[in-house]
């Protein structure tokens, strides 16, 4: 198992959560493993139990405090260890000196709502969740709209290169059902990645007025 392809990837949500995924080819599904967090300048330690998410993959969340509390800064280093039970003892399988603000993945945007809808246009707003005040305005967004007869993967990506928590969708078809999603990413961090997509927001454009050219 040790010589198989292993992966240990963790992301900080910028506030009080480090989420980790551990995968190892050849590892037994019922292997008991955990992630231990040991900060270099904090008094707390934290542990979470890795739970199976697929055949050879486990995940867990290190909850560092209240969801909106700022538990780590850009100068913190958190040593993360994967420990797996071997008989009566725990064996260290992986170690990483984790820099939280180099490995960011924010929570998905929330509170999506239609601000205004017309026949060809729709204005949508959203909010970011549990995002650090350190970012100020240094965030970007991607959005996509699901049209009838298409898949999310086919939807073109709309990029907002600034902290703009709204969008005006144009050239829509009247009286048509759409869905909309958005995700967010800080500009900071070597291994920073996009948040998960938001929950889809369903909306319908207004029908064209009868006898009018709109």
């Amino acid at each position: 198992a040790v010589n198989g392809t292993s992966q240990f990837t963790c992301f900080y949500n910028s506030r009080a959560n480090i989420s980790c995924v551990w995968s190892q080819d050849g590892a037994l599904q019922d292997t008991s493993c955990q992630v231990h967090a040991w900060p270099d300048r904090r008094r707390w330690n934290q542990t979470c139990e890795l739970l199976p998410v697929s055949q050879a993959s486990w995940a867990c969340n290190l909850i560092l405090g209240a969801p909106d509390s700022q538990k780590l800064t850009t100068v913190d280093i958190v040593t993360l260890r994967v420990l797996c039970r071997e008989g009566v003892r725990w064996r260290v399988m992986a170690i990483q000196d984790f820099k939280p603000f180099e490995n960011l993945r924010l929570m998905a945007p929330i509170s999506l709502q239609v601000v205004h809808v017309e026949t060809h246009r729709c204005n949508i707003s959203w909010e970011i969740s549990q995002a650090s005040h350190y970012f100020e305005r240094h965030l970007e967004f991607e959005a996509r709209t699901l049209s009838p007869g298409h898949t999310w993967e086919e939807a073109p990506l709309l990029t907002l290169k600034q902290k703009q928590e709204w969008i005006c969708l144009e050239t829509l078809t009247p009286d048509t059902q759409y869905e909309f999603q958005v995700r967010v990413k800080p500009l900071q961090g070597e291994f920073t990645t996009w948040s998960p997509w938001s929950q889809p927001l369903a909306f319908r454009t207004k029908p064209a007025a009868l006898g009018k050219d709109t």
Partner: nanobody, 127 residues
């Protein structure tokens, strides 16, 4: 492009000591891990030791545990391997390697986890 250059190899008698150094240049990663591997004539390349970015974690092959010590100096972008109580079976070309993702440990001793490699330095231990 990251370059790794090893130095400090040479000929030493069994029971003696050597310190290998690895200097990195041409780029930096926020939290990389560095390691030493070795390859003896006619054998596969094998893991020797690894160290995390801040030096808070180390990992050693069973064959060198207690004899070799890996350290790093991030200010000088160097990694050192202090080798004591050397044995003839330690004879090999020693390679420095870098893993940008920064993870080490028994599950990460495979050379495929390391992206950047040095050219190697020869260590010969005579009996």
């Amino acid at each position: 492009q990251v370059q790794l250059v090893e130095s400090g190899g040479g000929l030493v008698q069994a029971g003696g000591s050597l310190t290998l150094s690895c200097a990195a240049s041409g780029g930096a990663f926020s939290s990389d891990a560095k390691a030493w591997f070795r390859q003896a004539p006619g054998k596969e390349r094998e893991f020797v030791a690894a160290i995390t970015w801040a030096g808070r974690g180390t990992d050693y092959a069973d064959s060198v545990k207690g004899r070799f010590t890996i350290t790093r100096d991030n200010a000088k972008a160097t990694v050192h391997l202090q080798m004591n109580s050397l044995k003839p079976e330690d004879t090999a070309v020693y390679y420095c390697a870098l893993n940008p993702r920064g993870v080490i440990g028994p599950a990460f001793r495979n050379s495929n986890h390391y992206t950047y490699w040095g050219q190697g330095t020869q260590v010969t231990v005579s009996s």
